[in-house]
């Protein structure tokens, strides 16, 4: 695009005689003060004719010359008021003022939108002295204008504590539309309407919007920015973008993918992290979430034993941390385990089923029908019991542990005996006479020691006193008589 000046700006001489811009040798500048590195712009707007009415601040000097004639009021000469140009072009504009030579140390500063422009701007002030006045031209150039250069520029000069201000020069940088709001990627429910927003600005205005869906234009005619597109619903993923048009051309937004929420894919890689007799710790890798966050997961557990009734236990858990401890399982049992997870749309299919086994556990019940009696002739205590039900052994029985505590006149002594798994009776030596013997028995598997039976007490008399009556804990529902030897 060609740089434009919408207000005519022809160079006019400031003073009679050659204009400084012609750089004749007898009028070369006395002093040139660059504020930054010299640059020759693509376009220069020079001051316009002097003597036109002026709206900027005017300083009226109090000093008079030898002839006592008052000096004319000081004011910046009029220059171009509005410069319109395309982005990335160069521009140069200036302020000029004639200052009587009686004033020393005059400096011109540039201001934009009320803030002084300091630092590395391309500002140059040139002085052209004459007999009575010095012409000062302050030039400001921008090598490659950007939108941020838009604004109102003025010159200021201080004389006698008075501030002289030039008329503003409005710089309008025009370019392709610039997006202030672009459509965003979204995950949406199938066949449900949703909105996308697009907003772009100039200058130049107006900016018109066209929406594009999967490479097809949605609106046949331009819509004023900002534009909200109500998409009436999608059945499959789509890509949207918007085109912003102004007199300078077209800018296309980023393309955004709109995904359709779906049920998740099933979890993968379900694995056993740890097994105990009654629990299994599993982990899994979640499947694809279907563009909707996982809410929770369901662990399905069924007994792998072909003789089982096939019932499924279901354990619900949060979706994170992809880990769950399944509890209340039977020991030494085989299970099939599957995992399914859900999002707002629904449940995934179940993961591939995996086989898992619980380990042996300590028995969950004590031996039953414990009977204790004294065999005085051999100075032994005979103990008998019934082994716990197979279901509740939670493993293969390896034996029994017998605890017998002897209490007599403030003395208490506990002894432990281990017995092999085949027997259901044991004999222990009398440790103390005239004492109470308390017996408890626990079944033992490789998984550990089960609970001890309720204590059975028997009194061991001093030598010579016989009591044939046994002590026992009856087995529930067992009506068999207790045999007394």
């Amino acid at each position: 695009a060609i740089t434009e000046a919408r207000e005519e700006a022809k160079p006019y001489p400031l003073f009679p005689g050659p204009f400084p811009g012609s750089l004749q040798t007898d009028h070369t500048p006395l002093l040139s003060l660059p504020h930054a590195s010299g640059y020759q712009p693509a376009l220069m707007f020079s001051p316009t004719q002097p003597g036109r009415p002026h709206t900027g601040n005017v300083a009226i000097p109090q000093v008079t010359s030898v002839e006592s004639k008052p000096l004319p009021p000081l004011a910046f000469k009029h220059t171009v008021g509005h410069i319109i140009l395309s982005e990335h072009k160069g521009v140069k504009f200036n302020c000029s003022i004639s200052v009587p030579n009686i004033y020393q140390d005059t400096t011109i500063s540039w201001w934009k939108d009320g803030k002084e422009l300091l630092g590395a701007h391309h500002a140059i002030t040139q002085f052209y002295p004459d007999d009575e006045v010095t012409a000062i031209i302050a030039s400001f150039s921008i090598t490659s204008v950007q939108r941020s250069d838009n604004g109102s520029y003025i010159c200021k000069m201080k004389i006698n504590n008075e501030e002289i201000v030039s008329d503003p020069i409005y710089i309008e940088v025009q370019g392709l539309p610039h997006f202030t709001k672009q459509p965003e990627s979204m995950n949406v429910t199938r066949n449900t309407a949703f909105n996308l927003t697009c907003q772009a600005v100039g200058p130049p205005e107006p900016v018109n919007i066209f929406w594009v869906q999967n490479s097809s234009r949605v609106n046949e005619q331009p819509e004023k920015s900002p534009s909200v597109l109500t998409v009436p619903g999608l059945t499959e993923m789509a890509v949207f973008s918007c085109e912003a048009h102004n007199d300078k051309g077209l800018t296309v937004s980023k393309g955004v993918q709109i995904n359709i929420k779906a049920i998740p894919s099933p979890p993968t890689e379900v694995s056993i992290r740890n097994s105990t007799a009654h629990s299994i710790l599993i982990s899994w890798v979640p499947g694809f979430d279907g563009y909707s966050p996982f809410r929770n997961c369901s662990i399905q557990v069924k007994e792998a034993d072909p003789l089982s009734n096939g019932s499924v236990m279901i354990f619900n858990t949060s979706a994170l941390p992809h880990l769950y401890q399944i509890k209340q399982l039977q020991a030494l049992a085989n299970y099939s385990i599957g995992v399914s997870c859900m999002n707002e749309i629904g449940w995934s299919a179940v993961s591939p089923w995996i086989l898992a086994s619980t380990t042996e556990g300590a028995p969950s019940v004590a031996p039953l029908n414990v009977t204790v009696f004294l065999n005085e002739s051999s100075d032994n205590v005979d103990i008998r019991w019934m082994k716990p039900p197979t279901k509740q052994q939670d493993g293969e029985l390896v034996g029994y542990r017998i605890s017998h505590v002897w209490q007599s006149a403030g003395i208490s002594k506990e002894l432990l005996e281990e017995v092999g798994q085949n027997g259901s009776r044991a004999r222990i030596s009398v440790q103390v006479h005239n004492a109470t013997c308390t017996v408890r028995i626990a079944a033992v598997t490789r998984g550990g020691v089960g609970p001890f039976s309720d204590p059975v007490k028997i009194f061991i008399p001093a030598h010579g006193w016989v009591d044939y009556a046994p002590s026992s804990t009856p087995a529930p529902g067992n009506a068999d008589p207790v045999l007394i030897i």
């Epitope: 869906q213 609106n219 619903g233």
Partner: antibody
Framework: QVQLVQSGSELKKPGASVKVSCKAS????????VHWVRQAPGQGLEWMGW????????TYAQGFTGRFVFSLDTSVSTAYLQISSLKAEDTAVYYC???????????WGQGTLVTVSS | EIVLTQSPATLSLSPGERATLSCRAS?????MHWYQQKPGQAPRPLIY???NLASGIPARFSGSGSGTSYTLTISSPEPEDFAVYYC?????????FGGGTKVEIK
């Protein structure tokens, strides 16, 4: 309310021209395109093309180039369909319709019957 | 251009008997619109963008589909529903109509 009112029926001789008008009211004319649809007697709907009321640029479907011209007078919110060198097979009802997003035609004119007969 | 094929060409129904009208596209389209036309009248918008009822259209009408296959369903047709139905695609120019399905009283 939105309305599209078309001009009345026309009886023309082969080789003549006809200009059908479609006057819009109840909305900003230049915000929506105007589509033209033809329906020959006993036949289905045939999309002829549309005119961009913002730019005045017409788009013609295949088979509707040359003798068919879409035009506008935005000052009176009216779209026109002109057919020149009329043939007997141009006998049809011609409909104008307002086009919105997704090329949906949400309001239709009542139709104009053009009969070409010698 | 995308060719739209409507089937059946004629559907004979008793009032109240469910009507299912099909519209197949020669290649995938983004949305399908449906219009109803009665003899001597201009087409009337029925369904916008595959499944959205136009203003004033009763809920017994519904639309569905995606890709190349679209359906208009009248769950329980009333006497005033006996008419010709046209589908029209949005995806690419030219905008094409199907050949129409006539729903008539058996």
């Amino acid at each position: 309310q939105v309305q599209l009112v078309q001009s009345g029926s026309e009886l023309k001789k082969p080789g003549a021209s006809v200009k059908v008008s479609c006057k819009a009211s109840g909305y900003t004319f230049t915000n929506y395109g105007v589509h033209w649809v033809r329906q020959a007697p006993g036949q289905g709907l045939e999309w002829m093309g549309w005119i961009n009321t913002y730019t005045g640029e017409p788009t013609y479907a295949q088979g509707f180039t040359g003798r068919f011209v879409f035009s506008l007078d935005t000052s009176v919110s009216t779209a026109y369909l002109q057919i020149s060198s009329l043939k007997a097979e141009d006998t049809a009802v011609y409909y104008c319709a307002r086009g919105v997003r997704y090329a949906y035609m949400d309001y239709w004119g009542q139709g104009t019957l053009v009969t070409v007969s010698s | 251009e995308i060719v739209l094929t409507q089937s059946p060409a004629t559907l004979s129904l008793s009032p109240g008997e469910r009507a299912t009208l099909s519209c197949r596209a020669s290649s995938s389209v983004g949305y399908m619109h449906w219009y109803q036309q009665k003899p001597g009248q201009a087409p009337r918008p029925l369904i916008y963008a595959t499944s959205n009822l136009a203003s004033g259209i009763p809920a017994r009408f519904s639309g569905s589909g995606s890709g190349t296959s679209y359906t208009l369903t009248i769950s329980s047709p009333e006497p005033e529903d006996f008419a010709v139905y046209y589908c029209q695609q949005w995806s690419s120019n030219p905008r094409t109509f199907g050949g129409g399905t006539k729903v008539e009283i058996k």
